[in-house]
């Protein structure tokens, strides 16, 4: 008795965070024995779409020519082989930006921070929102925080960081959103450059220095309590 078919891999190109109106391609990769691929979208009638495999049959392409609110959401894919349907893929969360006006991102007390001290990034929206997100460019896990105030509508969110180290230096943006759909985000804020100067740090190089994989809960999360598979995003609920 053969075991269950291995689950396929699901991903999006050019990525899973897409601006309104832009195109995105969802790929589902199974095995060479696949006869058909099916894409399901959470809270939509299944299947959301079906595609025949592309040669050499181990993957299928699902195209979205122009991103809109309707396409934002959580997807899984399956493939059918002669012995039946596979296990579902890990979920892919497709996020659309541009649903709301852009928030403002600022640094308190200043975007120029001494290493070892603290800085608070403040994301402010014109209209009340219940979710605010902070991202750092070129971080391995770009989404550092997601903050939900238990349904309370607020105009701003504070993202404290301490102690600031060289890892924190870089360009940040924030987004705002409503709790009813975490897949719909505002336009990004204008970028904020955080500059870290080094007067408090030990000048001796660490013998174990390695490439940082994240800016730490410094991602810091900054310690994510949940993750968004394949989207490159990490969510942290406070």
């Amino acid at each position: 008795q053969a075991g269950p078919l291995p689950k396929p891999t699901l991903w999006a190109e050019p990525g899973s965070v897409i601006s309104w109106g832009n195109s995105v391609t969802i790929w589902c990769q199974g095995t060479l024995e696949a006869r058909e691929y099916r894409l399901d979208k959470e809270e939509s009638p299944a299947p959301w779409d079906r595609q025949n495999p592309l040669e050499p049959k181990n993957k299928a392409r699902f195209s979205i020519p122009s991103m809109t609110e309707d396409y934002a959401g959580r997807y899984r894919c399956y493939y059918r082989s002669p012995v039946g349907w596979s296990q579902p893929s890990d979920p892919l969360e497709l996020v659309m930006t541009g649903a709301y006006s852009k928030p403002t991102l600022s640094a308190l007390p200043s975007p120029l921070v001494t290493s070892g001290k603290s800085v608070t990034l403040l994301c402010q929206s014109r209209s009340p929102m219940d979710t605010f997100l902070l991202i750092k460019e070129r971080a391995a896990h770009p989404l550092l925080h997601l903050r939900s105030e238990h349904g309370a509508q607020q105009h701003q969110a504070e993202f404290p960081m301490s102690p600031v180290t060289s890892v924190h230096g870089g360009t940040y943006r924030c987004f705002s959103s409503h709790g009813f759909s975490h897949y719909l985000l505002s336009h990004p804020s204008d970028p904020l450059e955080l500059i870290v100067s080094g007067s408090l740090e030990d000048p001796r190089p660490s013998p174990t220095r390695s490439v940082s994989t994240a800016a730490g809960p410094e991602d810091q999360p900054l310690m994510p309590t949940g993750s968004v598979p394949h989207s490159g995003l990490r969510r942290h609920w406070e």
Partner: antibody, heavy 118, light 107 residues
Framework: EVKLVESGGGLVKPGGSLKLSCAAS????????MSWVRQTPAKRLEWVAT????????YYTDSVKGRFTISRDNARNTLDLQMSSLRSEDTAMYYC???????????WGQGTSVTVSS | DIQMTQTTSSLSASLGDRVTISCRAS??????LNWYQQKPDGTVKLLIY???RLHSGVPSRFSGSGSGTDYSLTISNLEQEDIATYFC?????????FGGGTKLEIK
């Protein structure tokens, strides 16, 4: 489940050396800054040293500068504190703790005891 | 260095009481104030970070407030398991510093 387990404590003579280690599991170690905090016999908590997530920045309390070295191995998920020129005032319970990135230490180990006495 | 002062070193209260523990910083710490609980066996747990944010898994009877230099931890309905020593800590700038602790006992 986040787990931090310290080891290496013991009795050492003044002027001696000791290396404390902390084995981390249950989280992506390389994403977090880490610290050593000690608790004196009088039960006061004192921050000792911090190392950034990539090991590139290290920070020490004044009383241990030049004597203690904090280091980490992200491949092995370990944090170390090399202590030398030990003094009686270094006698304490030493805790390894994870940073939450927002100025707090969100998980602590159970501690390892260091006694400096002749 | 920033000095952290917990003026009350020990406190007696009855089960069910509302208990408030205070902490003062020697200068403005911009809400970077955290509270920890240390049980008699030495176990240390984070309760509250950034003045008022509850750490995951911490019961909602714990709350924090304050700003500038003055901060407090409140336990709204004291339970037996809350018997411990509570420490405040500033995370605004290194060196991070702790208060002297407040030992909570049952009357």
């Amino acid at each position: 489940e986040v787990k931090l387990v310290e080891s290496g404590g013991g009795l050492v003579k003044p002027g001696g050396s000791l290396k404390l280690s902390c084995a981390a599991s249950g989280f992506t170690f390389s994403s977090y800054a880490m610290s050593w905090v000690r608790q004196t016999p009088a039960k006061r908590l004192e921050w000792v040293a911090t190392i950034s997530s990539d090991g590139g920045n290290t920070y020490y309390t004044d009383s241990v500068k030049g004597r203690f070295t904090i280091s980490r191995d992200n491949a092995r998920n370990t944090l170390d504190l090399q202590m030398s020129s030990l003094r009686s005032e270094d006698t304490a319970m030493y805790y390894c703790a994870r940073h939450d990135g927002r100025g707090a230490l969100d998980y602590w180990g159970q501690g390892t005891s260091v006694t400096v006495s002749s | 260095d920033i000095q952290m002062t917990q003026t009350t070193s020990s406190l007696s209260a009855s089960l069910g009481d509302r208990v408030t523990i205070s902490c003062r910083a020697s200068q403005d710490i911009s809400n970077y104030l955290n509270w920890y609980q240390q049980k008699p066996d030495g176990t240390v747990k984070l309760l509250i970070y950034y003045t008022s944010r509850l750490h995951s898994g911490v019961p909602s009877r714990f709350s924090g407030s304050g700003s500038g230099t003055d901060y407090s931890l409140t336990i709204s309905n004291l339970e037996q398991e809350d018997i411990a020593t509570y420490f405040c800590q500033q995370g605004n700038t290194l060196p991070w510093t702790f208060g002297g602790g407040t030992k909570l006992e049952i009357k």
